[in-house]
């Protein structure tokens, strides 16, 4: 069972948001299938996505075991219809991924404004704490559980009647801001990890929420 006419994978790319982590590659297979292996720098290789015709493999279950490790993956190419043979000694063509360190590299998912409440001239805006697939003692951890004080939120807010934006920052999931009485405001939040120096430092902005809609409450 040779590996003639199989093409090595290329363009191996990690796609990761809030630790949900997928390895993607090319090319779309023609008469071939793929198997992925993942390892930490000091660990053994573990096979995933056996003989798949897909060009992606979900490796979340492996990386969430330790999001602070650095991982390497490789994609093997086999002829279509390949069955593992104990007698086969020929190594199939494979390609290595770039290294991937989830804690430093996973993208921050789009946050959601959970609620806002106005009391007089103050508004309390609460950001929903997103769940991840990282576990501790069989309990899933939130983004805040994993990143702690490394994670902050930036609030953008503006009067519905104007375009001039103000900003506020918090290292919790709550903002308490001053507003003008009788004015409606709109809000959007962004998750930020200030310690990062790369493009994945910030999330995309949350959907805009405006006072006078159902997420808000007003009390005099």
């Amino acid at each position: 069972s040779g590996t003639t006419n199989t093409v090595a994978a290329y363009n191996l790319t990690w796609k990761s948001t809030n630790f949900k982590t997928i390895l993607e590659w090319e090319p779309k297979p023609i008469n071939q299938v793929y198997t992925v292996q993942i390892s930490t720098k000091s660990g053994d290789w573990k096979s995933k996505c056996f003989y798949t015709a897909d060009t992606e493999c979900d490796l979340t279950d492996e990386i969430v075991k330790d999001v602070k490790q650095t991982y390497l993956a490789r994609v093997f190419s086999y002829p279509a219809g390949h069955v593992e043979s104990t007698g086969s000694t020929e190594e199939p063509p494979y390609e290595n991924s770039p290294e991937f360190t989830p804690y430093l590299e996973t993208n921050l998912g789009q946050p959601t404004i959970q609620s806002f409440e106005q009391v007089g001239t103050k508004v309390n805006v609460t950001v929903q704490d997103e769940w991840t697939l990282v576990r501790r003692n069989d309990t899933f951890l939130s983004l805040r559980d994993v990143f702690g004080k490394d994670l902050i939120y930036t609030l953008y807010y503006w009067k519905s009647s104007s375009s001039g934006k103000k900003t506020a920052k918090t290292n919790t999931n709550e903002f308490l801001i001053d507003v003008d009485k009788g004015e409606n405001y709109c809000f959007s939040v962004q998750a930020v990890i200030p310690s990062r120096r790369t493009a994945n430092r910030k999330s995309t902005d949350s959907p805009v929420e405006c006072m006078g809609h159902e997420k808000g409450e007003s009390r005099e």
């Epitope: 490790q69 430093l104 501790r136 702690g148 310690s195």
Partner: antibody, heavy 120, light 113 residues
């Protein structure tokens, strides 16, 4: 096994410069904050600042900002605390520590400490 | 800055008895996002570096004996040693691990009566 090994004791004169080190092993150095803590003779613990070696990002206590510099060389898994001009009041034990795995879960591992004595 | 104040400054307790150390923070250490209190307790024995005992106010670090427990929320926290052992003689520190700058309490010296 996680270990933080600090450089040896130093005796310096006021005005001199100094760099002490903290070498991490047994874990992924780039993804854990290294903390620096001062303990003056017979006194309590004071947090000085920290660094995330993967990005070089630092935080300083206002009490130490401008007087010390924290840096790291991730290629040799070593963090540094340095002074450009020492004072007698810098005489203390200096500890490095590593943050815990989870967010805000304390300083889980500590170095053995470096005793710095500044005297004319 | 968050100020951490411990009480008492020193404490003498008989072997086998309960020891209680209090810690008060000038601001709440409760994270609204995950309802965790970012308060940490350390033990430091003479001539040694500190040792992490408890994080998130009540979560014992791996390997720490279960006679050590932490409680409290917001601004008021307690470290309890249910049955004092000779090896527990040390200085105990609480720490704000909630927000920068991180700050320690002044320490509580625990001795045997």
């Amino acid at each position: 096994e996680v270990q933080l090994v600090q450089s040896g004791a130093e005796v310096k004169k006021p005005g001199e410069s100094l760099r002490i080190s903290c070498k991490g092993s047994g874990y992924t150095f780039i993804t854990y904050w290294i903390e620096w803590v001062r303990q003056m003779p017979g006194k309590g613990l004071e947090w000085m600042g920290d660094i995330l070696p993967g990005s070089g990002s630092t935080n300083y206590s206002p009490s130490f900002q401008g007087h010390v510099t924290i840096s790291a060389d991730k290629s040799i898994s070593t963090a540094y605390l340095q002074w450009s001009s020492l004072k007698a009041s810098d005489t203390a034990m200096y500890y490095c520590a590593r943050s815990g795995y989870y967010g805000n879960s304390g300083f889980a591992y500590w170095g053995q400490g470096t005793l710095v004595t500044v005297s004319s | 800055d968050i100020v951490m104040t411990q009480s008492p400054d020193s404490l003498a307790v008989s072997l086998g008895e309960r020891a209680t150390i209090n810690c008060k923070s000038s601001q709440s250490l409760l994270s609204s996002g995950n309802q965790k209190n970012y308060l940490t307790w350390y033990q430091q024995k003479p001539g040694q570096p500190p040792k992490l005992l408890i994080y998130w106010a009540s979560t014992r670090e791996s390997g720490v004996p279960d006679r050590f427990s932490g409680s409290g929320s917001g601004t008021d926290f307690t470290l309890t040693i249910s049955s004092l052992q000779a090896e527990d003689v040390a200085v105990y520190y609480c720490q704000n691990d909630y927000t920068y700058p991180l700050t320690f309490g002044q320490g509580t010296k625990l001795e045997i009566k």
